[in-house]
């Protein structure tokens, strides 16, 4: 299996729908594999940090992966510190959403993307696309997509330039 | 400069509890996951707890669970280790650790010395 | 659990002289994301620990480069190139990928 998400950095305004692209390839298919997303919450607060990129925390944090290439001190940090949750499961057509996402309007579509209908403030987080199948236990089965999600009053031209925050609507 | 310091430790008799505190400065101290570390006299280093950047997540060494309780208040920059039902094996300097990437302890504070004993 | 152990615990050492530190653990600390969650500290007479080396071969920020990490998997070593006087002290590995465990520390002086 190898599994791949094509984007994997998501800033979205509350309440606005997102997709968080995944797709996978299989040397044999005989049965259609499971595809599980995870929530992880951030290891550090990413939001507070983009906020402020010339903080001595910001600059220790780029020496860190220039001697560590693809390292991410927001994703990278054990279970323990952080919130863990299943969202949704996909085996053939159905799909199940978590416990904790019952109620939302969250689906996985396509090969495997994970779309929300509309982002809610606990959202923002590190989404992991995993694909399991009994057939095929080689390769690259996980992949991430972190997701940020900023209210209409955040300084959201920081985070994407060229953005405009419109009214917000009733 | 970058800083932890420790205090509230003291003598105390077996079954009583003792709080800690641990005094953040020089760097963003909601942005960090938080640890404390114990020492026992001419012992080696013990891990003890940790907590998420924004409280929300804890977890603790198994010889603590359901003694100690780990805690924070990032408006005051403050860590907090709540030790009840101390025992004698509990004597330690406890320090407070800053978690930084690769899950390593980068600051570490003075340390505070705890005595259970009757 | 995962339980580090150090070799040796005690380790005279000679100014100007190389020394190495071993560290092995019950289990492999390498990551899937190709990282080995194993970090060196040192803690000198009196102080509090300090971190030398983290995620296997790291060097932290300030740590004078005779000191190296290497290894993979579940056998760790710390080299340091030519041992100075400030160097003594006791050294800890400690694995960082499930929870956290020392080792029971290597205590370096000056032979």
């Known amino acids: 299996i190898q599994v791949t998400v094509s984007d994997p950095y998501h800033v979205v305004i509350l309440f606005q729908p997102v997709t968080l692209p995944c797709t996978y390839q299989m040397t044999s298919t005989p049965t259609q594999p499971i595809v599980i997303w995870k929530y992880k919450s951030f290891c550090r607060d990413r939001i507070a940090d983009a906020f402020s990129p010339a903080s001595v925390d910001n600059q220790l944090n780029a020496q860190l992966v220039a001697g560590n290439p693809g390292y991410n001190p927001y994703v990278e940090c054990q279970d323990s510190v952080r919130t863990v949750r299943v969202v949704a499961t996909k085996q053939g057509n159905a799909v199940t959403l978590g416990d904790y996402y019952q109620g939302r309007r969250i689906t996985i579509t396509g090969n495997a993307d994970l779309t929300f209908d509309e982002t809610a403030w606990g959202d923002s987080g590190v989404y992991y696309c995993s694909v399991v199948s009994a057939q095929d236990l080689e390769g690259n089965n996980e992949a991430y997509a972190e997701l940020i999600v900023l209210g209409r009053t955040s300084g959201v031209a920081e985070l994407l330039p060229g953005f405009q925050a419109g009214p917000m609507e009733d | 400069q970058v800083q932890l310091v420790e205090s509230g430790g003291g003598l105390v008799k077996p079954g009583r509890s003792l709080r800690l505190s641990c005094a953040a400065s020089?760097?963003?101290?909601?942005?960090?996951?938080m640890h404390w570390v114990r020492q026992a006299p001419g012992k080696g280093l013990e891990w003890v707890a940790v907590?998420?950047?924004?409280?929300?997540?804890?977890h603790y060494a198994d010889s603590v669970k359901g003694r100690f309780t780990i805690s924070r208040d990032n408006s005051k920059n403050t860590l907090y280790l709540q030790m009840n039902s101390l025992r004698a094996e509990d004597t330690a300097v406890y320090y407070c650790?800053?978690?930084?990437?690769?899950?390593?302890?980068?600051?570490w504070g003075q340390g505070t010395m705890v005595t259970v004993s009757s | 659990d995962v339980v580090m152990t150090q070799s040796p615990l005690s380790l005279p050492v000679t100014p100007g002289e190389p020394a190495s530190i071993s560290c092995r653990s019950s289990q492999s600390l390498l990551h899937s994301n190709g990282y080995n969650y194993l970090d060196w500290y040192l803690q000198k007479p009196g102080q509090s620990p300090q971190l030398l080396i983290y995620l296997g071969s790291t060097r932290a920020s300030g740590v004078p480069d005779r000191f190296s990490g290497s290894g993979s998997g579940t056998d760790f070593t710390l080299k340091i190139s030519r041992v100075e006087a400030e160097d003594v002290g006791v050294y800890y590995c400690m694995q960082a990928l499930q929870t956290w465990t020392f080792g029971q520390g290597t205590k370096v002086e000056i032979k």
């Open positions: 020089g760097f963003t101290f909601s942005s960090y996951a």
């Open positions: 650790a800053r978690d930084s990437p690769g899950n390593a302890f980068d600051i």
């Open positions: 907590i998420s950047y924004d409280g929300s997540n804890k």
